[in-house]
């Protein structure tokens, strides 16, 4: 017996072929001996089978001796034998039928999990194989999952069904919420400007849902909300924002906030968070401010960052076109009765600098 | 072709009101950002308020908030700017203007109407 | 709100001149910035939008760029129907905010 493997939804062909290329009287029955349909002379003609409404066949191929059995939308249900009754002989085709469909909707957040479900006639013993767009193969049964998607999770799944030494293959659509990194840090000399962006990893025709950005100021005991907004088909509207600092937020995507200046004050960290209507569940993405200040007062150069920074950050204060005078890892260094010049203040990561600031030193009379 | 016509403009006294209205043809009007703008006589252009396409949000001046109210009619294509409370400085003419799709800028924009406040 | 300052507030120039004006945003705005030409009667009309994007139709001598919160508006050759008033407008967020004009006229 010949088998034959459907998806739900989709439309099957069922070939019969007869020994004559020319039209003859054929009939395509299922297991329960229901004819479906068959032809009269030229016509086409249909049983009370439950498939009547979704069967057909192709009358251009008759002539040719070839009897097709096509099914359109195909159901779970439609799993069964069918039998095409061609000049007194029998053929068998056995159409198993599966549906893979993702339990939940297909947009999920970054962290969550995915579930498959594989939908299957009776009596059939189905393995399911599916590769994920970054190159992770999953195997199971009826249901498969995935744990903590992550961004690179987002994308076309390709799931194999194997099923007597036969397979049909799934492709699920699969878009992960999130940012586009999980975390950021920018690096101002204070007074400077300071942007926040936020891009989204996804695009959706319309966006909706509340967003607001706590602020954890190093210099602070506590955290604070700067911003709460909302998001209405991709539009930003602020809904409440502190007086301190005196911040903006753009209208419209990628969200995108602005500081007027940068101040030791504001450096620390933030979490911007962003909850999707229909989800549960929010985005994140952290922001860290460094600010960066030098100073001289009186004999005493000084060089201070404030914010998050790594322990192998180096600060370092150099006179123009010369040697360090003074590298540490530390957030402070000064440098006692400095020569007249321009001085460099340099923050820097294994030789790369991340911040710099010049002051002036002038010559003492 | 998408075109904007505004009208209600006229001579009123300080402190009295006036309905600007501004019919859109050739566009669906709830996908769009609206704004007013105006331009004092000599002067230069000065946004009023705004309305996001969905109406639900609405954005005005300082120099204008507490006094003037935008709304919008999706089932007219009309844009308003009800004024209230006028004031000699309010006298101006009032462009409507709308945004694009995916940008913010006023792509097209209609011919004005004037708005005298005088006793 | 956010400020912005544009200069020069006028501007004397001849047919065939490169011109620029320029505009500075009190704060960080990305580039949610529009150039805007006026002239006498009539309704602004948009050439530049997102600080640098050409609006269809408007001949391509107009060019925008920006620098930071610093954006410029430059005619690389005035042609006689150039003269006339130039805005930009800061479109990054609610309250929007004109430039406070370059006018632009014929030495």
């Known amino acids: 017996k010949k088998v034959v493997l459907g998806k739900k939804g989709d439309t099957v062909e069922l070939t019969c072929t007869a020994s004559q290329k020319k039209s003859i009287q054929f009939h395509w029955k299922n297991s329960n001996q229901i004819k479906i349909l068959g032809n009269q002379g030229s016509f086409l003609t249909k049983g009370p089978s439950k498939l009547n409404d979704r069967a057909d066949s192709r009358r251009s191929l008759w002539d040719q001796g070839n009897f097709p059995l096509i099914i359109k939308n195909l159901k779970i249900e439609d799993s069964d034998t069918y039998i095409c009754e061609v000049e007194d002989q029998k053929e068998e085709v056995q159409l198993l039928v599966f549906g893979l469909t993702a339990n939940s909707d297909t947009h999920l957040l970054q962290g969550q999990s995915l579930t498959l479900t594989l939908e299957s006639p009776p009596g059939s013993s189905p393995s399911v194989q599916c590769r994920s767009p970054r190159g992770k193969n999953i195997q199971g049964g009826k249901t498969l999952s995935v744990s903590q998607l992550e961004l690179q999770d987002s994308g076309t799944w390709t799931c194999t069904v194997l099923q007597n030494q036969k397979k049909v293959e799934f492709k699920i659509d699969i878009v992960v919420l999130a940012f586009q990194k999980a975390s950021s840090i920018v690096y101002k000399k204070e007074g400077e400007q300071v942007e926040f962006s936020f891009p989204l990893a996804f695009t959706v025709e319309k966006l909706t849902g509340s967003g607001e950005l706590w602020w954890q100021a190093e210099r602070a005991s506590s955290s604070k909300s700067w911003i709460t907004f909302d998001l209405k088909n991709k539009e930003v509207s602020v809904k409440r924002v502190t007086q301190d600092p005196k911040l903006q937020m753009g209208k419209k995507l990628p969200l995108h906030l602005t500081l007027p200046q940068a101040l030791p004050q504001y450096a620390g960290s933030g979490n911007l968070t962003l909850a999707l209507e229909a989800k549960t569940g929010k985005l994140h993405q952290e922001v860290n401010l460094v600010v960066m200040r030098a100073t001289q007062l009186q004999k005493n150069l000084t060089c201070e960052v404030w914010g998050p920074t790594s322990p192998k950050l180096m600060l370092s204060l150099k006179l123009e076109n010369k040697e360090a005078k003074v590298s540490k890892r530390e957030k402070a260094v000064w440098v006692l009765n400095p020569e007249a010049g321009m001085w460099q203040c340099l923050l820097s990561d294994s030789g790369q600098v991340l911040l710099e600031s010049n002051i002036k030193v002038l010559p003492t009379w | 072709e998408v075109e904007l016509l505004e009208s209600g403009g006229g001579l009123v006294q300080p402190g009295g009101s006036l309905r600007l209205s501004c019919a859109a043809s050739?566009?669906?009007?709830?996908?769009?950002?609206m704004s007013w703008v105006r331009q004092a006589p000599g002067k230069g252009l000065e946004w009023v308020s705004g309305?996001?396409?969905?109406?639900?949000?609405?954005y005005y001046a300082d120099s204008v908030k507490g006094r003037f109210t935008i709304t919008s009619d999706n089932s007219k294509n009309t844009l308003y700017l009800q004024m209230n409370s006028l004031r000699a400085e309010d006298t101006a003419v009032y462009y409507c203007?709308?945004?694009?799709?995916?940008?913010?800028?006023?792509?097209?924009w209609g011919k004005g109407t004037t708005v005298t406040v005088s006793s | 709100a956010i400020q912005m300052t544009q200069s020069p507030s006028s501007l004397s120039a001849s047919v065939g001149d490169r011109v620029t004006i320029t505009c500075r945003a009190s704060?960080?705005?990305?580039?949610?910035l529009g150039w805007y030409q006026q002239k006498p009667g009539k309704a602004p009309k948009v050439l530049i939008y997102?600080?640098?994007s050409l609006q269809s139709g408007v001949p391509s001598r107009f060019s925008g760029s920006r620098s930071g919160t610093d954006f410029t508006l430059t005619i690389s050759s005035l042609q006689p129907e150039d003269f006339a008033t130039y805005y930009c407008?800061?479109?990054?967020?609610?309250?929007?905010?004109f430039g406070q004009g370059t006018k632009l006229e014929i030495k």
């Open positions: 203007a709308k945004e694009g799709y995916n940008w913010n800028y006023m792509d097209v």
């Open positions: 050739g566009l669906t009007f709830s996908t769009f950002a």
């Open positions: 309305i996001s396409g969905s109406g639900e949000n609405t």
């Open positions: 704060h960080g705005i990305r580039n949610d």
């Open positions: 997102e600080a640098s």
């Open positions: 407008l800061q479109d990054y967020t609610y309250p929007y905010t």
